[in-house]
Amino acid sequence: PRSIDVKYIGVKSAYVSYDVQKRTIYLNITNTLNITNNNYYSVEVENITAQVQFSKTVIGKARLNNITIIGPLDMKQIDYTVPTVIAEEMSYMYDFCTLISIKVHNIVLMMQVTVTTTYFGHSEQISQERYQYVDCGRNTTYQLGQSEYLNVLQPQQ
């Protein structure tokens, strides 16, 4: 069997909302993956599990099942959304994300994703992790790859 290549492309969009009373930030982050099947037979993308970390704390998890079948020598682009919550001991981040004197409120998030594929009863897992910059101050749609390697503003007292 030839390889199944998984490429994490980046954040496609991030939609933000707040609970003012609890100083909680809700970020719905949609990510894009390219999965390439280099085989001469179809493979099934059985599931995608993803999690997002902020400051070494897991702030969101998602799992997609029975996603798609990728034909021989074919590639599919798959979007998946991870709902994240920045709250409790991290709710001081609300003080940064809702600051109105700056226009971009980039925070560093670590995206982890594991893709499970199956073919002929054989299962294979491919994992990727990548640091991305997401604006926690407004709804943002990104050009693919745009959320990588930006200058990040890190809140400080």
Partner: antibody
Framework: EVRLQQSGPELVKPGASVKISCKTS????????MNWVKQSHGKSLEWIVN????????FYNQKFKGKATLTVDKSSNTAYLDLRSLTSEDSAVYYC????????????????WGQGTSVTVSS | DIVLAQSPASLAVSLGQRATISCRAS??????????VHWYQQKPGQPPKLLIY???NLESGVPARFSGSGSGTDFTLNIHPVEEEDAATYYC?????????FGGGTKLEIK
């Protein structure tokens, strides 16, 4: 120099409404949240409302919902407090106050205050 | 709502001595390392003036004789040495959640 200049004293009849203004200067109006605070004679302070001047999103003390409405006019850098169905309980000095901030975070303390507007409700 | 209880309601302190004002919150007003309590000074006929923000940070232009401390639920404003011009009413305020509330005030008289 940061300045918050409030409108003059008001004497109004019970049941009437009043609109108080707070004209700001010396800073970028849309870069700072604005608050209004009530102080009844000889009493402590009561926070009424906080507003984001960019989009008009206002967050009210539930006690003042239905009593107070906060609006902003970005073109004149002015915040307005509308008080309706006035009773003697609403007689007080009302202050506008800017929410201070550090370079990269809010602190929610009020660093600059208007001189206050006295509202007296009497028949 | 979070209630802030200030004590004493009034105090008289001799010139050059220390004035200590307490503020107790009905529940914690801290998140992580940040404490959302602020102190104001108000003189008759004037608006309040910010002295201390986030429990212990001195506002720009405020004399160093003012200091704030505390975290969680118990906070203190210290003035040392007290000067004549410090005669005023002092308020604590929290901003941990909505609605923000103020303490009842402490009236400081200079002897």
């Amino acid at each position: 120099e940061v300045r918050l200049q409030q409108s003059g004293p008001e004497l109004v009849k019970p049941g009437a409404s009043v609109k108080i203004s707070c004209k700001t200067s010396g800073y970028t109006f849309t870069d700072y949240y604005m608050n209004w605070v009530k102080q009844s004679h000889g009493k402590s302070l009561e926070w009424i409302v906080n507003i984001n001047p960019n989009n008009g999103d206002a967050f009210y003390n539930q006690k003042f919902k239905g009593k107070a409405t906060l609006t902003v006019d970005k073109s004149s850098n002015t915040a307005y407090l509308d008080l309706r169905s006035l009773t003697s309980e609403d007689s007080a000095v009302y202050y506008c106050a800017r929410e201070g901030q550090l370079r990269l975070r809010r602190v929610y303390a009020m660093d600059y205050w208007g001189q206050g507007t006295s509202v007296t409700v009497s028949s | 709502d979070i209630v802030l209880a200030q004590s004493p309601a009034s105090l008289a302190v001799s010139l050059g001595q220390r004035a200590t004002i307490s503020c107790r919150a009905s529940k914690s007003v801290s998140i992580s390392v940040y404490t959302y309590v602020h102190w104001y000074q108000q003189k008759p006929g004037q608006p309040p003036k910010l002295l201390i923000y986030l429990a212990s940070n001195l506002e720009s232009g405020v004399p160093a004789r003012f200091s704030g401390s505390g975290s969680g639920t118990d906070f203190t404003l210290n003035i040392h040495p007290v000067e004549e011009e410090d005669a005023a009413t002092y308020y604590c305020q929290h901003s941990r959640e909505l609605p923000y509330t103020f303490g009842g005030g402490t009236k400081l008289e200079i002897k």
